[in-house]
């Protein structure tokens, strides 16, 4: 008789990334009998929740359940019903909720409590909702990209199975940019990590890793923009802010109360003689760059070397994967190609920022105006952060790889988070087992 394939023995996991500007739900799938192998977990679905980040629901927490429904329903459709009860669901909230917690621990707890109650209503194995630390966010992002790039595999290959693979076991650094924070994580070369807060030790698949990580709260692209506006309005002579980071002809009215709503602008807060001001774009990359640099305090460093604001940063080492908003912004600007030099990126940004707003709106009809208006700032900010903040140079720029997905899975902290919580990254290298004979009967 002919051998008949048994139903595939697979497992699923769900992670919700509750970011500052939006929430995304990721569904992962892996063969049950290969849980400890490296590279077997892959993403089968991403569902972006329609609407803002969960921290925006602070005044209407009872509606969080409505907001999450569509993506949780999607998970019910994608995952076979027979697997629902054993599929773990994790929600990790990042810097948007860290900021809310700084303002009010009670409000942050209330939001998380409603999130937990909402997610507990679904037929999955809900494992909890929590605010992850910046250190965790950096570490899990680093684990994700190196897991997907096959860097933890001990089998050396003569061929490359994934892009960016340099066919050695040297790990990639991870550069993550969100709306409210940014993370830098990498293995420094034979360098002591001078500040204990930035040091992580991992033993993964039988190998030890000494990892540097730091999360800069308030230096995500959205909060950095609020910081810049709060800084610049201090010296404005009236309620008009001529802003080089917005396109010529762009106009937007900003409420001062909105500007000072975030803890990120507290250091620039002052009593202003007006309740509103108008941003008027002038579209000048160089001036925008100069204004952004004022957000980075580089005058003080208690270590051998710092990034900015007195934070230790070892010398950069190896290749880096830049993902999340690093990728989305550069992708929009068509600047993710490996062949584009840092000088060329700067040139393109100068041209882009100088384009009139009406022209930009016509060229990008399908893009939300709020996002569209901020690409000049965001692109300039990315350059400033990488070059002046993290000390990349025109030469080392080629070691930055702007990555959206690796092998079909999004680069980001969620996969690393799930791998850790489901104990799927062993400390020791698993013993190699003979080929499974369970596939056929």
């Amino acid at each position: 008789t002919q051998n008949k394939a048994l139903p595939e023995n697979v497992k699923y996991g769900i992670v919700l990334d509750a970011g500052s500007s939006h929430t995304s739900l990721y569904i992962y799938k892996w063969p049950a009998e290969k849980e400890n192998d490296t590279g077997v977990v892959h993403q089968v679905e991403e569902c972006r929740v329609k609407g803002p980040g969960i921290s925006k629901f602070v005044q209407k927490v009872n509606e969080i359940g409505i907001y999450l429904t569509d993506c949780m329903e999607r998970a019910r459709e994608v995952i076979p019903r027979s697997q629902h009860q054993e599929t773990p669901v994790y929600l990790g909230a990042t810097a948007g909720m860290r900021l809310l917690r700084m303002e009010s621990e009670e409000l942050a707890d209330r939001v998380l409590d409603v999130v937990e109650r909402s997610l507990s209503n679904y037929p999955f194995d809900f494992q909890g909702a929590r605010i992850i630390t910046g250190q965790e966010e950096g570490a899990y992002g680093w684990i994700t990209i190196n897991y997907l790039l096959g860097k933890f595999s001990q089998k050396t290959r003569w061929f490359s199975i994934v892009p960016y693979e340099t066919n050695n076991q040297e790990t990639f650094g991870a550069l993550d940019l969100g709306g409210a924070s940014t993370q830098v994580t990498f293995v420094p070369q034979n360098q002591t990590i001078e500040s204990p807060d930035n040091a992580l030790q991992f033993r993964l698949y039988g190998k030890d890793y000494n990892v540097y990580t730091h999360s800069f709260l308030c230096y995500g692209k959205d909060q950095a923009l609020w910081q810049k506006l709060a800084k610049d309005i201090q010296v404005a002579s009236n309620e008009i802010l001529r802003d080089p980071c917005f396109h010529p002809g762009y106009k937007k009215v900003v409420n001062v109360s909105d500007l000072y709503k975030t803890p990120c602008t507290k250091r620039f807060e002052m009593t202003l003689p007006f309740q509103q001001f108008e941003i008027q774009g002038i579209g000048n990359y160089q001036q925008c760059h100069q204004s952004i640099l004022e957000l980075f305090n580089t005058s003080y460093c208690p270590y051998s070397q710092c990034a900015f604001n007195g934070i230790f940063l070892p010398p950069l080492q190896g290749d880096f994967g830049a993902f999340s908003a690093f990728y989305f912004v550069m992708k929009f600007l068509n600047l993710t190609s490996e062949k584009v030099s840092q000088e060329k990126v700067t040139e393109m940004m100068k041209k882009f920022c100088a384009q009139p707003w009406e022209e930009i709106k016509t060229s990008y009809a399908g893009v939300k105006e709020k996002y569209l208006s901020e690409y000049c700032f965001s692109g300039t900010y990315i350059l400033s952060l990488l070059l002046q903040g993290y000390h990349f140079t025109a030469d080392s720029w080629e070691h930055i790889h702007f990555i959206g997905k690796i092998q079909g899975s999004d680069a980001g902290w969620t996969l690393g988070y799930m791998l850790n919580l489901t104990n799927m990254i062993p400390a020791e290298q698993p013993l190699s087992t003979p080929l499974s004979h369970s596939t056929y009967v």
């Epitope: 500007s21 209407k60 569509d70 949780m72 399908g366 709020k370």
Partner: antibody, heavy 121, light 111 residues
Framework: QVQLVQSGAELVKPGASVKLSCKAS????????VHWVKQAPGKGLEWIGK????????KFDPKFQGRVTITADTSTNTAYLQLSSLRSEDTAVYYC??????????????WGQGTLVTVSS | EIVLTQSPASLSVSPGERATISCRAS??????????MNWFQQKPGQAPKLLIY???NQGSGVPARFSGSGSGTDFTLTISSLEPEDFAVYYC?????????FGQGTKLEIK
Amino acid sequence: QVQLVQSGAELVKPGASVKLSCKASGFSIKDTYVHWVKQAPGKGLEWIGKIDPANVNTKFDPKFQGRVTITADTSTNTAYLQLSSLRSEDTAVYYCALYGYDDDAYYFDYWGQGTLVTVSS
Amino acid sequence: EIVLTQSPASLSVSPGERATISCRASESVDNYGISFMNWFQQKPGQAPKLLIYAASNQGSGVPARFSGSGSGTDFTLTISSLEPEDFAVYYCQQSKEVPYTFGQGTKLEIK
């Protein structure tokens, strides 16, 4: 200043097809779902289906399935409803609508002005 | 599919008075702790407008005199004190499951 502008009225013959458009401005259709609703003359509202323009997932009322196609072009911020094998009972005003949460967690709804489709020989 | 039945089919009320419209579903529209019931208003020659979503939440810019209540299969739209601009047709809609369905409508007329 969000606007949904629908294409103009259509007079079509039975058995023919028609494609209606719904163009959004001031808002990205990727950030919500686009719904299509039918209203026959003097009658109530009937939900046809919806699309998630971000990933082109669609859902329909089974009674329209097969004769109706919903698509979206995110580069032009436009959603489309195609009706095929038209019959007289398809004569109606067709509305496109968006509803959901905005960036400040306010629940919005935006509707097009409607497109009258008349099926007549 | 879930069938929604509105009552009454039409209602005559004087301005300043209270109006109540009911909507009954053929099966529960509750799921995950949420009641997936919406209410719309439509004036002649105009597109509908969302008043209430998820049974009791007010849409953006909807006056406070409009409120929604209920759960399971029985829902109510209440207009506490009618204004002249409130005379229109009102529809309930369930969004618990596809196909989303509307009630047949209730015409609110001036007495």
